[in-house]
Interface confidence: low
């Protein structure tokens, strides 16, 4: 049988001779050279050679365990004379023994990591890892220990895990942002003689909101003209914040002060400035200086840093309002005046008043905008603003006069203002009532006494406060011996009644009745209107047949019949029905 133990060979042999591995030997070998040893398998004849007589094996080259830790070969023992094996072919192993010939190598040449500033001691930053190619199962050649060569006292490394942690309290990004840490990995458990490798870790402190905004000055002063419309920016203020990003975002607000409702502050998102703007119209004459308290605060607050104090700061903003030469201001936005229509020329209607709002209180002069009073009906006293008539008025022609008055600063004519005047003309009873239409009617020859043949209506251009009250009567010269009577209905109408039985058209074909219409206002106005009554032949039904030698003419000039087209009072319908009449030559 074969006689050997497992073969071991030290790697990286540096001797000048071949390295002896071991001896193959069969108990059949009597030492007389009758046996021949043959080697085959991994590296046989190249890396490993055998003395075929003695069975001694040697390595011809330096071996690297990290390249190949085990070689598997086969051994044969042959009888030289017969050529037959004296032992069965057998497999054996040459195991390469490790030496510490590899240093630890980090997985990265440079690591980058971040950690929040002000982090607690022991906060995890990053884990570095080094590997050692030597045999971890034998000795300490591959036992790696980590240590920090550069970066203390800020950071530490756990010797076994390579975990880097913060080691110093209150590391402040605003003081120092970048750190370069050098970590060493050493094998042999870190003992003397161990091999080592290093890596660099670039650590950046990330920002946390540990700094409040701060105004660089406690007071700001801005000027703005009183004419600045709402929304006008009048100045910028800027608080500084040592933080970055959203931690440096600043919101501005007006927290106090007499101008809280007059001004606003908005945040410019790009520049992080507070823009003071006008909120309401300013008036130099009312208030010339405003003092505001403006606050700058961080929107993104980290509660754990609230102990550092409030994350806001205040500044005083003084705003000086500059005077602007303003036009005169009328005492009212519009004036409503009234005057009787019978007013004489130069009658004063009322007055307007305007004043220069500026401190100078420049005197003003008044005038009428002639584009609004082309007929020059009104005038104004340029000094005191009194409005007076310069022509006679007529309410029935124009009830309202809408004119514009201009107030101009005497010292600066460019500064002027306008105000509307609405002048109402009050009614005076200066118009007489008159017939509402032209009245021409007829009576049948066979008419009975006290028959209604026409109802009268009147109109009046005036507009009395208590309404119209008209009275109707026959003119005095016609009242005695008249063939007709007027019946006043006391409702602003009157009726014409027959006064006798029967009329003869051959004796009198036409009657002209003068009717007096009076109103009831002061002074009383009256007029006389004439009603034409024609005597007509009628049939036994009362239908008109002929009225002398002409037809009845409607005021419009159209031929008409009595009745529906020529509207008689309904009382007439008892006498005749509506019917067209014929022309009689």
């Amino acid at each position: 049988s074969w006689m050997w133990n497992q073969f071991f060979l030290l790697e990286e042999y540096t001797g000048s001779d071949y390295q002896y591995v071991g001896k193959l030997h069969s108990d059949q070998d009597r030492g007389d050279g009758s046996l021949k040893y043959i080697l085959s398998g991994d590296g046989a004849g190249d890396l490993f050679i055998i003395n075929e007589n003695t069975g001694d094996i040697q390595a011809t080259k330096r071996l690297d365990r990290e390249e190949k830790p085990v070689y598997i070969l086969r051994a044969q023992a042959i009888n030289r004379r017969t050529g037959r094996p004296v032992e069965p072919e057998s497999e054996f192993i040459i195991k390469i023994h490790d030496i510490n010939d590899n240093e630890p190598i980090f997985t990265k040449d440079v690591y980058t990591a971040t950690v929040p500033e002000m982090a607690d001691v022991g906060t995890f930053v990053v884990q570095v890892t080094a590997t050692d190619a030597d045999d971890p199962t034998y000795g300490n050649s591959a036992k790696v220990v980590y240590s920090i060569l550069q970066g203390q006292p800020y950071f530490s490394v756990e010797s076994e895990t390579g975990i880097i942690k913060t080691a110093l309290l209150n590391m402040d990004r605003e003081n120092r942002e970048q750190y370069q840490v050098v970590i060493q990995a050493k094998d042999m458990g870190g003992q003397m003689g161990g091999l080592s490798g290093t890596t660099t870790v670039n650590i950046t402190l990330t920002d946390v909101n540990d700094n409040p905004p701060r105004f660089p000055q406690s007071t700001y002063q801005f000027k703005t003209p009183e004419s600045s419309p709402p929304g006008t920016p009048i100045g910028r203020i800027k608080a500084s914040d040592a933080d970055v990003g959203e931690n440096a975002e600043i919101e501005y607000s007006i927290t106090d002060g007499e101008g809280h409702d007059m001004f606003d502050v908005i945040t410019d998102q790009e520049t992080q400035e507070g823009i003071i703007t006008v909120k309401k119209l300013l008036d130099f004459e009312k208030k010339r200086v405003y003092t505001l308290k403006v606050e700058a605060s961080n929107p993104h607050i980290e509660p754990r840093f609230l102990y550092l104090g409030p994350f806001k700061d205040s500044a005083t903003v003084r705003i000086v309002v500059d005077d602007v030469d303003e036009p005169p201001v009328f005492s009212k936005l519009a004036y409503i005046l009234q005057i009787r229509e019978d007013a004489q020329i130069n009658t004063t209607i009322g007055s307007v008043a305007a004043q220069d709002p500026d401190a100078a209180r420049n005197p003003v002069k008044y005038s009428v905008d002639r584009h609004t009073d082309m007929d020059r009906i009104f005038n104004i006293d340029s000094g005191n603003g009194s409005i007076f008539t310069s022509k006679l008025l007529d309410r029935e022609t124009l009830l309202w006069h809408n004119i514009t008055v201009i107030a101009t600063e005497i010292n600066n004519p460019k500064q002027s203002s306008r105000v509307p005047l609405y002048i109402k003309v009050l009614d005076v009873n200066d118009n007489a009532p008159e017939f509402a239409e032209f009245y021409e009617t007829f009576v049948c020859e066979k008419a009975k006494a006290d028959q209604l043949i026409q109802t009268l209506h009147a109109v009046d251009k005036d507009d009395p406060y208590s309404g119209h009250q008209f009275s109707f009567s026959l003119a005095p010269e016609a009242a005695s011996g008249s063939n007709f009577t007027i019946q006043d209905n006391k409702d602003n109408t009157a009726g014409i009644l027959t006064r006798k039985n029967g009329y003869n058209r051959h004796e009198m074909s036409t009657y002209l009745l003068p009717v007096v219409i009076s109103d009831n206002d002061y002074p009383v106005q009256s007029s006389t209107g004439t009603v034409t009554v024609r005597v007509c032949a009628c049939d036994h039904h009362g239908n008109m047949q002929s009225c002398h030698a002409e037809a009845l003419i409607h005021p419009t000039g159209l031929s008409t019949g009595a009745g529906s087209e020529f509207r008689h009072d309904s009382g007439l319908n008892d006498i005749f029905e509506a019917q067209k009449i014929e022309w009689h030559e």
């Epitope: 919101e251 605060s297 961080n298 929107p299 993104h300 509660p303 609230l306």
Partner: antibody, heavy 120, light 106 residues
Framework: QVQLVESGGGLVKPGGSLRLSCAAS????????ISWVRQAPGKGLEWVGF??????????NYAAPVKGRFTISRDDSKNTLYLQMNSLKTEDTAVYYC???????????WGQGTLVTVSS | DIQMTQSPSSLSASVGDRVTITCRAS??????LNWYQQKPGKAPKLLIY???NLQSGVPSRFSGSGSGTDFTLTISSLQPEDFATYYC????????FGQGTKVEIK
């Protein structure tokens, strides 16, 4: 970047329960108050409730229509907000959004929403 | 509860138009008024906070004004991407939204 992602929506019968989640990332979740908002189909936005940060004692507040039925909670270690909805009604059908409450009382980041349908 | 009333409820406008949306609170809300834009199927997006402050990343054609009870959102020159629904929201006492204003293409 700041992200809010809602999940847990679905179909539920009237009277049933549902729990919505809102996973946050890209900001210090524990420092912010977070709100739930809903929007019924084709309708406007309606505030549901909010929960303040740890620094403010995790105070909660609810809109009148959901008070007593809905509960908001949070797990800062998981960066997650929850909305527990009980005794659901058909009028609770809506897309539910979570939104980060920023200083000056506005909501600067919203999730994409999750649909809750309450129907028999 | 504070009620928020938006007007108009919808409007039609063309690209380049100046658009104004108003929002009225039932009681004073100081300046705690925010404006949001919402497009179909999307979450609302903050445009203006505290009545007049432009949210970072929002185009400068959007502006807000007002205080007390009356507030306005103005789009100085309407762009194609601005067609959406706009909501006002008060944050003075809890939160309530306006009913929304839909801006459509004319």
């Amino acid at each position: 970047q700041v992200q809010l992602v809602e999940s847990g929506g679905g179909l539920v019968k009237p009277g049933g329960s549902l729990r919505l989640s809102c996973a946050a990332s890209g900001f210090t979740f524990s420092s912010y108050a977070i709100s739930w908002v809903r929007q019924a189909p084709g309708k406007g936005l309606e505030w549901v409730g909010f929960i303040k940060s740890n620094a403010d004692g995790y105070t909660t507040n609810y809109a009148a229509p959901v008070k007593g039925r809905f509960t908001i909670s949070r797990d800062d270690s998981k960066n997650t907000l929850y909305l527990q909805m009980n005794s659901l009604k058909t009028e609770d059908t809506a897309v539910y959004y979570c939104a980060r409450i920023r200083y000056f009382r506005n909501w600067d980041y919203w999730g994409q929403g999750t649909l809750v349908t309450v129907s028999s | 509860d504070i009620q928020m009333t938006q007007s108009p409820s919808s409007l039609s406008a063309s690209v380049g138009d100046r658009v104004t949306i108003t929002c009225r609170a039932s009681q004073t809300i100081n300046s705690y008024l925010n404006w949001y834009q919402q497009k179909p199927g999307k979450a609302p997006k903050l445009l203006i906070y505290r009545a007049s402050n432009l949210q970072s990343g929002v185009p400068s054609r959007f502006s807000g004004s007002g205080s007390g009870t009356d507030f306005t959102l103005t789009i100085s020159s309407l762009q194609p991407e601005d067609f959406a629904t706009y909501y006002c929201q008060q944050g003075d006492s809890s939160w309530t939204f306006g009913q929304g204003t839909k801006v459509e293409i004319k």
